[in-house]
Interface confidence: medium
């Protein structure tokens, strides 16, 4: 079945912004390529693991590639897959787990000496159908074994801010963590109203730089809705 | 702070086409998510569409999706709305905003921080 081959992508109580403004149900809303958000209050849950859709890898988390649920199925209908781990079939790098990649349809690990900070190896096999043409690792890859080698610049895979460059933190943008800059005075920023609640984001913030605290700003031109802008604020 | 100045609105027969535009001053445009909104007479402003930094990504809600085109030059600091197929439920005044940064959450109204006055688009059927 369907749900067999579904991963963690879907995630429990999902925040307003993905239904559209808060308070404001109206219509569903896609983002291309062939993602939708629902509206209203009807978010996916972890319970019903619903599909998270794609058109490529880099649109899925770190540990997950894109393709069709089913053997040999529609192209067209591609969702976020668990990666593949050590010793298991792949076709491409992307399907492998981070630290591993794909040689001769097998995931192997990718050792230390492999990786020399930049990718120096062009592979072009190819496997049946399935984004067939191994051109090259895949970004999502070469920037995860980068890390080991190099701080992680604006829009590097990550797992926690330490990858990152000075001035950047590890944030979930859709399914992946990339480093991003640390927010400066103005910026938009979020308030949690409870604790554990950062880690359901899709589009989650950096905090807010030295000498700064995300607060209420009063001035802001829906009055009515002030409370729920947030921004950075000298202290 | 960045200016936004919408234009490009008018009257139009259903079935037709309009090309809005939103030109920033102030600030490039090319660092942030930009999105157009929509508020039709008594009704909420409601989300019409967004296109983040690079142009990459798009969002549409389903109201539009087909009919409606967003792009952005950040080399003139424009973001463009093609609307095509216009439908007397398209009649609006539509506003042009522009959020803080690349990362905001681009179907979020409260993340925009600037926004433009506004063009008025008139749909008769």
């Known amino acids: 079945t369907l749900n067999s081959v579904l991963n963690s992508n879907a995630i429990k109580n999902l925040p307003p912004p993905l239904g559209g403004a808060a308070g404001h149900p109206g219509s569903a809303v896609s983002a291309a390529p062939g993602i939708l958000y629902p509206g209203g209050n009807k978010y996916q849950t972890i319970d019903n693991y619903q599909p998270y859709p794609c058109a490529e890898d880099e649109e899925c988390g770190t540990d997950e590639y894109c393709a069709s649920p089913t053997r040999g199925g529609d192209a067209g209908v591609q969702i976020c897959l668990a990666c593949r781990k050590r010793r298991k079939r792949c076709m491409r790098h992307a399907m492998c787990c981070p630290g591993n990649y794909c040689k001769n349809g097998i995931c192997v690990s990718s050792d230390q000496n492999h990786f020399r900070g930049e990718i120096e190896e062009t592979i072009t096999e190819s496997f049946g159908n399935d984004h067939s043409t191994l051109d090259g690792y895949s970004r999502r890859t070469t920037l995860s074994s980068k890390m080991y080698h190099t701080k992680g610049q604006e829009g590097s895979v990550c797992l926690r801010s330490s990858d990152c460059a000075s001035g950047l933190c590890c944030a979930r943008h859709f399914w992946s963590k990339i480093c991003k800059p640390v927010l400066k005075e103005g910026q938009v920023c979020t308030k949690h109203r409870r604790k554990g609640s950062h880690g359901l984001e899709i589009f989650q913030r950096c905090y807010c730089g030295e000498g700064l605290s995300c607060r209420i700003q009063k001035d802001h031109h829906q009055a009515s809705n002030s409370s729920r802008l947030h921004t950075c604020q000298r202290h | 702070e960045v200016q936004l100045v919408e234009s490009g609105g008018g009257s139009v027969q259903a079935g037709g086409s309009l090309r809005l535009s939103c030109t920033a001053s102030g600030r490039a445009l090319s660092s942030a998510v930009v999105g157009w909104f929509r508020q039709a007479p008594g009704k909420e402003r409601e989300f019409v569409t967004a296109i983040n930094w690079s142009g990459a990504r798009t969002y549409y809600a389903d109201s539009v999706k087909g009919r409606f085109t967003i792009s952005r030059d950040n080399a003139k600091n424009t973001v463009y709305l093609q609307m095509d197929s216009l439908k007397s439920e398209d009649t609006a005044v539509y506003y042009c905003?522009?959020?803080?940064?690349?990362?905001?959450?681009?179907?979020?109204?409260?993340?925009?921080?600037?926004w433009g006055q506004g063009t008025q688009v008139t749909v008769s059927s």
């Open positions: 905003a522009s959020a803080s940064d690349r990362y905001a959450r681009p179907l979020d109204e409260y993340e925009y921080v600037s």
